[in-house]
């Protein structure tokens, strides 16, 4: 590390005094202090001499020594004073340029150090300094105002109490530059917009910044619009609006609008599209099927998109049958907008009962007349079975009848024992029929269907079962002769989902 | 005052039918639906179907295969029977009167135990 | 099936304190959704249904919120008699319940 003589930190002297310092290091030194008349320098290899022999008080500051070749980089410093009566201060720049946030240093040097205790800031005119300024003072630097805002942008003096009286330095000019964290910040209104020939619009550009330098524009399909410009400054930023004002669109005032802001940070643009239409439009629509089928006791979602212009003036959810007159109930639809012109149309229908199978139909009106969309609901049901004993043509024959939705399959089973199920180890045959006979079929109800097993002998010791299954689940019926005549054993096991 | 009540044997050998009876007062079983659920001990509470007003039935799949749900309205009775019973379905059975979204009232419970 | 999924299992608050219970669908069921007390050795007894209706003669510090997956039971000042388990179910389908949370007093 470099040595400097005479080895104090702080030297004091008068004007016109000679001063010498002398730096001393291994290799090559070099010296750095403020800009000042009257040295000279003179530099014998590894020792460099600073002298002056007429110090004024412009000599105030601090000298540093550093030896270049140090890898350490280390160095030596020595602060001058050139108490001069008439000139406190030695001010070093008379502009300073800080950014937001930044410690602004006013580099007012104190020529005598005995002065200290009664130093203060103000600002040019004998102002006070503004509310929450926050500073702090060293003699060897001056004051430095700490996180400096925009406000503070102000021209200051350093005062020092001489004899009883305030003497000032000369003014110095503080620059706080807003910190710009990057392009203007734009909104552009509407989103989207929809209008019907020879209707008015209004499209609103705006761009704000915390920096009053920026440009805004609009552009209708990459053409550039002259618009006047309404400038404004609150919530400290300043805005630029752009309201472009049509009184009847017509189909040439259609496509994309853009908004262009920018700065030193860089540019940001949002679009929006204007659509002019030749009439009112209603358009319904949905991403399910408009056929749905669903088990019985599950819940379902009817949901409906609907684009509009203008804006609805009615919708409701109606069921059209078959079964009971009811009606959905309010508290189960919803409706959700997810912008101006789409909405969505919900109706909700938790554990779905046999009656609400049928028709729903979403209706809703705008000046463009009215709309409809229509579901449809079909309910699954696993079988239910029943087996009676008839005749038929003189022939014994046992009859089961199934119903459920969609049309359950019919298989009989004949098996050793009584029992109110056939189990494998019991079966002694199996007959499918692939075709029975359909006794029902309409729309939203179940379909019932009807199997004839003839027998022209019933085994006493054996039951007939009767199994109908559909993607739904299953359901069988067990018929047991005994020799007073027949017996029927109803679905214990009555459903099954495989 | 709207009450239901169960009625149930306690006690069930394993691969036998369970028969419980749900008597209801304060209401009428045509006007509303009636579920049945029961709470075992390592499940939490478990719907196992539901009697409509009008009489039709929805079940849980899994009990689909052994559980009939039926009622009597004149005597404001409805019943339960699973059949072919194992240990875990050992719990408590609440009737329970369904309001389609909620269940409002809630029976006291019988509670069945199935062991040999 | 849709399942229920209810936090904590189990939780042990003060008197007069706030207290919070969870309710995860593991699919959108609307505000289908109840919630039951169940004192020991009692049935169930009905507290909020359609996710925010607090039931005839339920003290109003019982609040239920939330829709389609994510649902709570709020207690905003907890009563000696509160000491319950609480369960949530849904009956946007097939009805299922959560597992319970058990609500002890310190």
């Known amino acids: 590390i470099p040595v400097i003589e005479p080895s104090v930190p702080e030297l004091v002297v008068k004007p016109g005094a000679t001063v010498t310092l002398r730096c001393v290091g291994n290799g090559s030194v070099e010296w750095d202090g403020p800009p000042s008349p009257h040295w000279t320098l003179y530099s014998d290899g590894s020792s460099s001499i600073l002298s002056t022999n007429n110090a004024t008080f412009q000599n105030t500051g601090t000298y540093r020594c550093t030896e270049p070749g140090d890898p350490l980089g280390g160095s030596a410093a020595i602060h001058l004073y050139v108490k001069d009566p008439a000139r406190p201060w030695n001010v070093l720049a008379q502009e300073v340029v800080v950014f937001e946030d930044q410690d602004a240093l006013l580099p007012c040097l104190l020529t005598d150090p005995v002065l200290e205790a009664g130093v203060s800031l103000v600002r040019v005119r004998g102002r006070p300094l503004m509310r929450h300024t926050n500073y702090s003072f060293s003699p060897w630097h001056g004051f430095t105002i700490h996180r400096a805002k925009f406000i503070q942008s102000q021209d200051y003096q350093c005062s020092a109490l001489m004899g009883g009286r305030k003497v000032m330095s000369i003014s110095i000019r503080l620059k706080v530059q807003k910190v710009i964290p990057g392009p203007p910040a734009l909104t552009l209104v509407p989103a989207e917009l929809v209008r019907i020939r020879g209707e008015a619009a209004q499209i609103v550009c705006s761009a704000s910044s915390v920096d009053v330098n920026f440009d805004v524009f609009l552009q209708h399909n990459n053409t550039k619009l002259a618009i006047p410009q309404q400038s404004d400054f609150h919530n400290n930023r300043y805005q630029k609006v752009l309201t472009l004002n049509l009184d009847q669109v017509d189909f040439q005032h259609a496509g994309n609008y853009s908004c262009v802001a920018s700065n030193v940070q860089g540019k940001h643009s949002t679009s929006m599209f204007f659509r002019v239409v030749e009439s009112a439009y209603l358009n319904l629509s949905s991403e399910q099927n408009l056929i749905q089928e669903v088990t019985v006791g599950e819940g379902l979602n009817l949901k409906v998109m609907v684009e509009a212009y203008p804006g609805l003036q009615g919708f409701n959810w109606t069921y059209l049958g078959p079964f009971s007159d009811h009606q959905p109930e309010p508290k189960l639809a919803n409706a959700t907008t997810k912008d101006t012109y789409r909405h969505t149309f919900t109706l909700s229908l938790p554990r779905l009962k046999p009656s609400e199978a049928g028709r729903y139909s979403f209706l809703a009106r705008n000046p463009g007349g009215w709309r409809a969309l229509t579901f449809e609901l079909t309910l699954r049901y696993p079988p239910e079975v029943s087996v009676i004993w008839t005749f038929i043509n003189g022939s014994g024959t046992l009859l089961c009848a199934a119903s459920g939705y969609p049309q359950p399959n019919v298989t009989w089973l004949q098996c050793s024992g009584h029992t109110d199920r056939c189990d494998e180890a019991q079966v002694l045959q199996v007959w499918d029929d692939p075709y029975p006979e359909v006794l029902s079929q309409e729309p939203f109800h179940k379909v019932t269907v009807q199997s004839l097993l003839t027998v022209e002998t019933l085994e006493h010791n054996q039951t007939y079962e009767c199994r109908a299954h559909n993607s739904v689940g299953s359901g069988s019926w067990a018929f047991i002769p005994i020799s007073a005549g027949a017996h029927t054993h109803p679905p214990d096991e009555f459903l099954f989902t495989p | 005052r709207v009450q239901l009540k169960e009625s149930g044997p306690g006690l069930v050998a394993p691969s036998q039918s369970l028969s419980i009876t749900c008597t209801v007062s304060g209401f009428s079983l045509t006007s509303y639906d009636i579920s049945w659920i029961r709470q075992s001990p390592g499940k939490g509470l478990e719907w196992l179907g539901v009697?409509?007003?009008?009489?039709?039935?929805n079940y849980n799949s899994p009990f689909m295969s052994r559980l009939r749900i039926s009622k009597d309205d004149s005597r404001s009775q409805v019943f339960l029977k699973v059949n072919r019973l194992q240990t875990d379905d050992t719990a408590i059975y609440y009737c329970?009167?369904?309001?389609?979204?909620?269940?409002?009232?809630w029976g006291a419970g019988t509670t069945v135990t199935v062991s040999s | 099936k849709i399942v229920m999924t209810q936090s904590p299992k189990s939780m042990s608050v003060s008197v007069g304190e706030r207290v919070s219970l969870s309710c995860k669908a593991s699919e959108d069921v609307g505000t289908y959704v109840s919630w039951y007390q169940q004192k020991p050795e009692q049935s169930p007894k009905l507290l909020i249904y359609g996710s925010s209706n607090r039931y005839t003669g339920v003290p109003d510090r019982f609040t239920g919120s939330g829709s389609a997956t994510d649902f709570t039971l709020t207690i905003s000042s907890v009563q000696a008699e509160d000491l319950a388990d609480y369960s949530c179910?849904?009956?946007?389908?097939?009805?299922?319940f959560g597992t319970g949370t058990k609500l002890e007093i310190k």
């Open positions: 009697i409509w007003s009008g009489g039709g039935t």
């Open positions: 179910g849904q009956s946007f389908t097939y009805p299922t």
């Open positions: 329970v009167r369904d309001l389609r979204l909620y269940f409002d009232v």
